[in-house]
């Protein structure tokens, strides 16, 4: 682990200390800047990122400190060692003095952050533009007007057809210079990310002709998440939400297409619920059926009246301190109408417990209740909108008879968690059950449903 | 008819800890259905919670205060105590002890103790 | 922490008016709001809980409202010995909260 850089294990001993960031938690590193100000944006250097972690899990929270002392969550971030990760902050609105970076990853480096200003912030009145100087590989011309002014674009018209040159950009501020930008290598009469057609052979998915991140195209031309790209050069759109369920979102968007059922799968939703807090004000019964797709799950949310109780159950009858001291246990029934051998349960979220008070991912409980009211447990899990609905695949023991399931417990231990549907996934047109009960000379017709009578034809 | 009834020194030096206790009588501070806190009131001004039991033991402090409060609970005494160290001037109040319910609001109330920090 | 701001800080009024006084929450704390009466050299005595509920044996003429970050306590009658100091206070989440207060004098 670098010097110059901070990770949570660089000061502990690998054999002697347990992982240095524990669920749920973790560390934080907190930093203060020189001047406080109102943001624009954060962008922050990650130089080392655990594979366990791949780029979701490791920076579980952000948070700016305000100087009028609130916390403002930014919340989990994607973040990759070979580009800085920049956070727009348009809707801050007041002047921040540091900043917190949760993680779980105690592996995880941190080599620097940036606060950038909004524009005219009055620390800026004595400074001086930037300008920038372009450096290639074969090296320039001389006569070459290399150091850009107010425009930022440079053209190069040395070029010869099939050449490789790689460009790099230094930043010039008075006397000082910048290190050289990372090196972008162009092969001249090919394509390239930025020229508005897609080369599906240097692994584009798309062009918009700009190197802006959140428009849809990445500055890899990469199709971003909740965006479809069509046409050259790209124009994308977040079809997300859009109320078209489209082919390639069928199984990514709830709010368009509904719950995805994959093929050779049937979804039940439940037919009844029974809960263990309930009023006029958070009845049970609002988690039979499917769950309404405007229902988006929210994260960090406090007060739970705000119109959830319509499409979610949630425990309104305790408050969350009483419940946190007291420990009390929640929970929740789901009967199906048709009993089946499960594939899968599946959890529909609108909140997932968590608060800004506490870094702690809410776990639920969930357990399989099955026609002879035996119970079999599926475990423990952690709740999160980033894994909504969440899909709980039941893995049945092949040396114990397989058994119909007729309804689905889940408890839980925060009022803070409100549950809009839970479904019981089984197979369709194939029961296990009546499979291994099926008698010498018999065979499962799936049309059935049933063990039918065969005889072999010689 | 619960009743609460809070005890302790009326003065204490800075930079000492303050002990204080609070007496149940009339039910059973083991009941699941509440919880147990102290509340301040400095002279004039308004009501800060300070802390809160179940009678399991398990807490949650004022994080304001977190570093110098300890609360703690004795059901075979129908007792839970408060202790806050390291008190300066800041700290002279009236010191009540209450009930919460699952609605976390305080429906019993100790006559209150004032507590004076000087030396 | 939740901040709970109340208004008025004091008010004037006479026998028999109606009284109202508000309190807002920084952030939406659901229904989990109480409020409470006290006088001086008292320990404060509850009026209502979850924001609408009127503890047992407090006079039918307080009564609470609100959800979410705005909250009502309302005297429909003052009657004299409802001159005193009026706390809203906020269960939604630790640390629990209190709004400064607003005293209720005689005009």
């Known amino acids: 682990s670098s010097v110059r850089t901070w990770s949570p294990n660089s000061a502990v001993n690998p054999h002697t200390v347990p992982p240095a960031c524990p669920e749920p938690q973790g560390c934080y590193l907190e930093l203060e800047f020189l001047y406080p100000l109102v943001p624009e944006s954060l962008t922050i250097w990650v130089t080392f990122v655990s594979t366990d972690w791949d780029s979701s899990g490791a920076v579980n929270d952000i948070k700016l400190l305000a100087v009028s002392g609130k916390n403002i969550s930014l919340g989990p971030q994607n973040v990759f060692c070979d580009v800085p990760l920049t956070i727009r902050l348009w809707d801050v609105g007041e002047e921040v003095y540091g900043i917190q970076i949760y993680t779980l990853d105690e592996h995880l480096e941190i080599d620097a952050a940036m606060l950038t200003s909004t524009a005219d912030t009055p620390l800026c009145l004595q400074c001086k533009p930037l300008k920038y100087k372009v450096v290639r590989d074969p090296p320039l011309q001389m006569d070459v007007a290399s150091i850009l002014h107010l425009n930022r674009k440079f053209v190069d018209m040395d070029l010869n057809l099939g050449s490789v040159y790689q460009y790099w950009v230094i930043t010039i501020s008075g006397t000082e210079e910048s290190e050289p930008s990372p090196a972008v290598t162009y092969i001249h009469g090919s394509g390239y990310c930025g020229d508005g057609i897609i080369q599906k052979d240097q692994g584009e998915q798309c062009d918009d002709m700009n190197k802006i991140n959140g428009d849809g195209c990445s500055l890899f031309c990469r199709q971003e998440v909740s965006f479809n790209c069509i046409d050259e050069p790209s124009r994308c759109y977040f079809h997300d939400g859009d109320g078209v369920c489209e082919e390639f979102e069928q199984k990514t968007s709830i709010k368009d297409c509904g719950v995805y059922t994959p093929q050779g799968f049937l979804d039940q939703w439940a037919s009844n619920a029974s809960v263990s807090h309930q009023d006029q004000q958070c009845p049970g019964w609002v988690i039979i059926g499917q769950p309404a797709a405007s229902q988006v799950c929210r994260t960090k949310v406090i007060d739970l009246s705000e119109g959830i109780s319509q499409h979610a159950w949630y425990p309104c009858t305790i408050s969350y301190p009483y419940s946190q001291l007291a420990q009390t246990t929640f929970w929740l029934r789901a009967y199906f109408s048709q009993p089946m051998v499960a594939a899968a349960v599946i959890v529909h979220l609108v909140t997932d417990g968590t608060y800004y008070g506490d870094q702690k991912q809410e776990t639920i409980s969930v357990q399989l209740l099955d026609t002879k009211d035996q119970s079999h447990d599926l475990g423990l899990h952690v709740l999160s909108c980033r894994n909504n609905p969440l899909i709980i695949p039941v893995v049945h023991d092949l040396s114990q008879p397989f058994y119909h399931s007729q309804a689905v417990r889940v408890s839980f231990s925060s009022p803070l968690v409100a549950i809009s549907g839970v479904a019981l996934r089984s197979f369709d047109n194939f029961d296990p059950v009546t499979l291994s009960s099926c008698q010498r000379g018999e065979t499962y017709s799936p049309a059935e449903q049933s063990c039918v009578h065969f005889a072999c034809e010689k | 008819q619960l009743q609460l009834q809070e005890s302790g020194p009326g003065l204490v030096k800075p930079s000492e800890t303050l002990s204080l206790t609070c007496t149940v009588s009339?039910?059973?501070?083991?009941?699941?259905?509440?919880?147990w806190g102290w509340i301040r009131q400095p002279p004039g001004k308004g009501l800060e919670w300070i802390g809160s039991i179940f009678y399991s033991g398990s807490t949650y402090y004022n994080p304001s205060l977190k570093s110098r409060v300890t609360i703690s609970v004795d059901t075979s005494k129908n007792q839970f105590s408060l202790k806050l160290s390291s008190v300066t001037a800041a700290d002279t109040a009236v010191y009540y002890c209450?009930?919460?319910?699952?609605?976390?609001?305080?429906?019993?109330w100790g006559q209150g103790t004032l507590v004076t920090v000087s030396s | 922490d939740i901040q709970m701001t109340q208004s008025p800080s004091s008010v004037s009024a006479s026998v028999g008016d109606r009284v109202t006084i508000t309190c807002r929450a920084s952030q939406g704390i659901s229904r989990w709001l109480a409020w409470y009466q006290q006088k001086p050299g008292k320990a404060p005595k509850l009026l209502i809980y979850?924001?609408?509920s009127v503890q047992s044996g407090v006079p039918s003429r307080f009564s609470g409202s609100g959800s979410g970050t705005d909250f009502t306590l309302t005297i429909s009658s003052l009657q004299p010995e409802d001159f005193a100091t009026y706390y809203c206070?906020?269960?939604?989440?630790?640390?629990?909260?209190f709004g400064g207060g607003t005293k209720v004098e005689i005009k």
């Open positions: 206070q906020q269960g939604n989440v630790p640390p629990l909260t």
């Open positions: 009339g039910g059973s501070i083991s009941s699941s259905d509440y919880y």
């Open positions: 979850a924001a609408s």
């Open positions: 209450a009930r919460a319910t699952t609605s976390s609001s305080a429906d019993y």
